[in-house]
Amino acid sequence: RDCAEVFKSGHTTNGVYTLTLPNSTEEVKAYCDMEAGGGGWTIIQRREDGSVDFQRTWKEYKVGFGNPSGEYWLGNEFVSQLTNQQRYVLKIHLKDWEGNEAYSLYEHFYLSSEELNYRIHLKGLTGTAGKISSISQPGNDFSTKDADNDKCICKCSQMLTGGWWFDACGPSNLNGMYYPQRQNTNKFNGIKWYYWKGSGYSLKGTTMMIRPADF
């Protein structure tokens, strides 16, 4: 069950909940946003203060890391299995250092299995964080510091830091280095969402959240 099911079962308070996959006993702790846009959102990524190192290995990105109450990555394997069981939407919420907020909403999101390196699939972009997708389309394989699956000679994950669906290297990386205020400009390896803030701007906060399309 995901946060949408938790919400429908009567839990309407934001917080950390234990989620399971259908036909599985495997449990994962995730933060559920039960207020934004009707609630039921499963948070799959959050950056807010630089407290967690996102330059992690393939296996760490596979199973997840960090603190669900703070900065964390839910885990590619769980997200892949979840998003291949029914249609999910992906909402990416962004904050800059000047107090502005924006979002990108994809009407269909799923990750391929590990067989294809958790390749990202996205359709139907709307929102205020750019008319063009800052995640390259068609979607690319996921890369980490020890799994160079991008299309650049440069090894994007090592150069830009963090695991991401790099192209060569592409217009985004929400798992890049966290830079504090007044150090967040002209940073090639920061938290980037090009079609909102350009190439050198490193964001203050990001949240990636998913919910069934029929919620």
Epitope: P138, D141, D146, K151
Partner: antibody
């Protein structure tokens, strides 16, 4: 430099088994996925299988699935291909190939090959 | 499975010629395309990955381009050592598949 040396090829009768090996050197073997690719005499290239860097994931082409098994021993820097129920159409040069990463699917460095002939 | 069709299957060219080999996939492979060179009796050697990235040590006379389903390998000025068979390969998804090869011969 990267070096891949295949061995174990030879003549084998149809229906029998054979194991070919690949000794790797010049790189950190346990950090890379490995593939087997074959080439029948005078023909093109055919991908057979991949094993991930840690041995956890393996994928095969339909032509060998259920008959061939890819494995590795990271402590010995060696890749294996166990071939069972061999057929005449399995006659080919068998190449051991390094992946560019843990499993990028890009075929980076190739060994010189070992010839397997299936004949009665 | 994704099929890869290479053309031509063979070509004759002279030293110094510009040679172009094309490769077509049965579906969009999103630039997950590589090119290999194979000389008689030798193992293949990787030339290009991700459509256009030259493998380390490969001379700049080789270049690759394309997108979607259609890709091209170009040799800007053919030299004696370039007379070989060239293969394209998609690594978008399993099973990995190769084109049938293009044999470049001396005119």
């Amino acid at each position: 430099q990267v070096k891949l040396v295949e061995s174990g090829g030879g003549v084998v009768q149809p229906g029998r088994s054979l194991r070919v090996s690949c000794a790797a050197s010049g790189f950190t073997f346990s950090s890379y996925g490995m593939h087997w690719v074959r080439q029948a005499p005078g023909k093109g290239l055919e991908w057979l299988a991949i094993i991930w860097y840690d041995g956890d994931n393996k994928y095969y082409s339909d032509s060998v699935k259920g008959r061939f098994t890819i494995s590795r021993d990271n402590s010995k820097n060696t890749l294996y291909l166990q071939m069972n129920s061999l057929r005449a159409e399995d006659t080919a040069e068998y190449y051991c190939v390094r992946d560019a990463s843990i499993a990028s699917r890009f075929l980076d460095y190739w060994g010189q090959g070992t010839l397997v002939t299936v004949s009665s | 499975d994704i099929q890869m069709t290479q053309s031509p299957s063979s070509l004759s060219a002279s030293i110094g010629d510009r040679v172009t080999i094309t490769c077509r996939a049965t579906q969009d492979i999103n630039n997950y395309l590589a090119w290999f060179q194979q000389k008689p009796g030798k193992a293949p050697k990787s030339l290009i990955y991700a459509t256009s990235n030259l493998q380390s040590g490969v001379p700049s006379k080789f270049s690759g381009s394309g997108s979607g389903t259609d890709y091209t390998l170009t040799i800007s000025s053919l030299q004696p050592e370039d007379f070989s068979t060239y293969y394209c390969q998609q690594y978008h998804s399993y099973p990995l598949t190769f084109g049938g090869g293009t044999k470049v011969e001396i005119k």
